[in-house]
């Protein structure tokens, strides 16, 4: 199964500046951290902190580094081979449904419900009904969800789909 890579903004490159390293493509491809020249004869390095490429490629331009929004913290900076990794600040989270912004976690559960999961950068607090053990959404939670709160998934580059 393919790794599905989402569309990103191009970082326009002018004619390669003297400090940009050039090398020859291998099998028509350039290594991570580089893009290919228009004529396909040269690999040109991406600019550290400005743009990047993650795989062997024949991109005409490296990909523009993501800038973390206000309300996000930078876990790791952009390098020539890896995009910036951003994460929501403490007390906020990003849902898969609305990845464009960090939302404030709720401070507590509604009346008649008990907290079973903490606020993480990936999820709001989780509440279940005291009696029935059902989630706020009405779903019946898996047994482990009523016992522990998930630590969340590893942080990933916060580049958004285009």
């Amino acid at each position: 199964e393919s790794a599905l890579i989402t569309q990103q903004d191009l970082a326009p490159q002018q004619r390669a500046a003297p400090q940009q390293k050039r090398s020859s493509p291998s099998e028509g491809l350039c290594p991570p951290g580089h893009h290919i020249s228009e004529d396909g004869r040269d690999c040109i390095s991406c600019k550290y902190g400005q743009d990047y490429s993650t795989h062997w490629n024949d991109l005409l331009f490296c990909l523009r580094c993501t800038r973390c929004d206000s309300g996000e913290v930078e876990l790791s900076p952009c390098t020539t081979t890896r995009n910036t990794v951003c994460q929501c600040e403490e007390g906020t989270f990003r849902e898969e449904d609305s990845p464009e912004m960090c939302r404030k976690c709720r401070t507590g559960c509604p009346r008649g419900m008990v907290k079973v999961g903490d606020c993480t950068p990936w999820s709001d607090i989780e509440c279940v009904h005291k009696e029935s053990g059902t989630k706020h959404s009405g779903e019946v939670p898996a047994v482990e969800e009523t016992v522990t709160s998930s630590p969340g998934t590893p942080a990933s580059p916060c580049s958004l789909s285009g």
Epitope: A3, I5, E27, T54, H55, N57, D58, F61
Partner: nanobody, 126 residues
Framework: EVQLLESGGGLVQPGGSLRLSCAAS????????VGWFRQAPGKGREFVSA????????YYADSVKGRFTISRDNSKNTVYLQMNSLRPEDTAVYYC???????????????????WGQGTLVTVSS
């Protein structure tokens, strides 16, 4: 921003033919190679074919070799996929892709792409 637009999908009987088109707007395709992937219902996205827009070198998945032909018209910024002898197992959403990504330089099959079209549905059924 690179934008890819597919067209040409539809319903066809087994043994029939279709031609898919992929047109690039914006700053052309953003890469030298352009390819096609497909995703059948309930399955992962798989590589179908690719073409080098500079010299016309072509690449095919074993499952479509001899039946599908990829071509390009650089003056129209368009890449085509001619699909002949279609089979029910070719039923899928077909995606045009650019900025193909490979784990190694010698690999013939990309693991993904930077730029994707919205997809066009091809249904092979009698």
């Amino acid at each position: 921003e690179v934008q890819l637009l597919e067209s040409g999908g539809g319903l066809v009987q087994p043994g029939g033919s279709l031609r898919l088109s992929c047109a690039a707007s914006g700053r052309t395709f953003g890469s030298i190679r352009v390819g096609w992937f497909r995703q059948a219902p309930g399955k992962g996205r798989e590589f179908v074919s690719a073409i080098n827009r500079n010299d016309g070198t072509t690449y095919y998945a074993d499952s479509v070799k001899g039946r599908f032909t990829i071509s390009r018209d650089n003056s129209k910024n368009t890449v085509y996929l001619q699909m002949n002898s279609l089979r029910p197992e070719d039923t899928a959403v077909y995606y045009c892709a650019a900025g193909l990504q490979y784990n190694r330089a010698a690999d013939r099959v990309p693991v993904g792409a930077v730029y994707w079209g919205q997809g066009t549905l091809v249904t092979v059924s009698s």
